[in-house]
């Protein structure tokens, strides 16, 4: 297993609709054809997997149908979008990139993107 540098923004505020997008960029040392991207969430020392996708270079990322993540790739960049976020989902979202094929296997883990999520203010009751 060889190490690889992964860069991602430090802080992102999700939209009022609970959507956060950020780029995860990896310094590919070779010509990988198969890449696996995993998003991990760290909150209060607990790390959980949010979503993962394996893709062939030049093709779209395919997450599971029920995944809250979508993404596109361009060269050594992966544009990740996480939706359905609520205030309780605020946390550090870490991008993990694995170059699966051809060998050698490379692994890179970013420092994480702190995603802040603000629940929208409830609309005031209106009398008709």
């Amino acid at each position: 297993c060889k190490a690889m540098h992964v860069a991602q923004p430090a802080v992102v505020l999700a939209s009022s609709r609970g959507i956060a997008s950020f780029v995860c960029e990896y310094a590919s040392p070779g010509k990988a054809t198969e890449v696996r991207v995993t998003v991990l969430r760290q909150a209060d020392s607990q790390v959980t997997e949010v979503c993962a996708a394996t893709y062939m270079m030049g093709n779209e990322l395919t997450f599971l149908d029920d995944s809250i993540c979508t993404g596109t790739s361009s060269g050594n960049q992966v544009n990740l979008t996480i939706q359905g976020l609520r205030a309780m989902d605020t946390g550090l979202y870490i991008c993990k990139v694995e170059l699966m094929y051809p060998p050698p296997y490379y692994l890179g883990i970013g420092n994480g993107t702190q995603i802040y999520v603000i629940d929208p203010e409830p609309c005031p009751d209106s009398d008709f």
Epitope: P9, A10, V11, V12, L13, A14, S15, S16, S21, F22, A43, D44, A87, T90, L92, G112, Q114, Y116, I118, D119
Partner: antibody, heavy 117, light 108 residues
Framework: QVQLVQSGAEVKKPGASVKVSCKAS????????ISWVRQAPGQGLEWMGW????????NYAQKLQGRVTMTTDTSTSTAYMELRSLRSDDTAVYYC??????????WGQGSLVTVSS | EIVLTQSPGTLSLSPGERATLSCRAS???????LAWYQQKPGQAPRLLIY???SRATGIPDRFSGSGSGTDFTLTISRLEPEDFAVYYC?????????FGQGTKVEIK
Amino acid sequence: QVQLVQSGAEVKKPGASVKVSCKASGYTFTSYGISWVRQAPGQGLEWMGWISVYNGNTNYAQKLQGRVTMTTDTSTSTAYMELRSLRSDDTAVYYCARVGANWFDPWGQGSLVTVSS
Amino acid sequence: EIVLTQSPGTLSLSPGERATLSCRASQSVSSSYLAWYQQKPGQAPRLLIYGASSRATGIPDRFSGSGSGTDFTLTISRLEPEDFAVYYCQQYGSSPWTFGQGTKVEIK
């Protein structure tokens, strides 16, 4: 080193607007947020809101909603805070601070805004 | 809105003494999102502690933070002359982000 440098003191009349700038250096500007905090004379710190420089999304304190606008110019690594319809109780030192994963650091030196007729 | 209440309002101590500052939240705050700042007259606040207990870069080890849930503490083990200032706690886990009203540590 990481630094935030703010614009100078301003004197404004009630009802006017003020725009305070905060120029960042020493780090990747788009990777972090910028928060604004104010401090009235002899008082404590009041959080005004913040902007996620990466995507431009903002979160404002409810009491200032509609009067405050936070923006950034990524070409010059500068953040701006505009406050409209100024009142005498808006007289304060206005600070910008870099928002990291779980901290505000560093802070700008502060900009005194005096609202007086 | 989470209200942070700091106590005492003023702490009168001598250099070399131990200072214990309290910050109590009106509802639970994730310890990841609780910070302490020091402010001296005419200066901007300076980050001391983040994540309730992690010391910021360049902060001497006489400063320590602890606590979880609704009760947080900043401890200065041995007061130095330059430590006399106002200290604020802040939470940024729940919007609106809020500050405590401050504790002034003054020379006795």
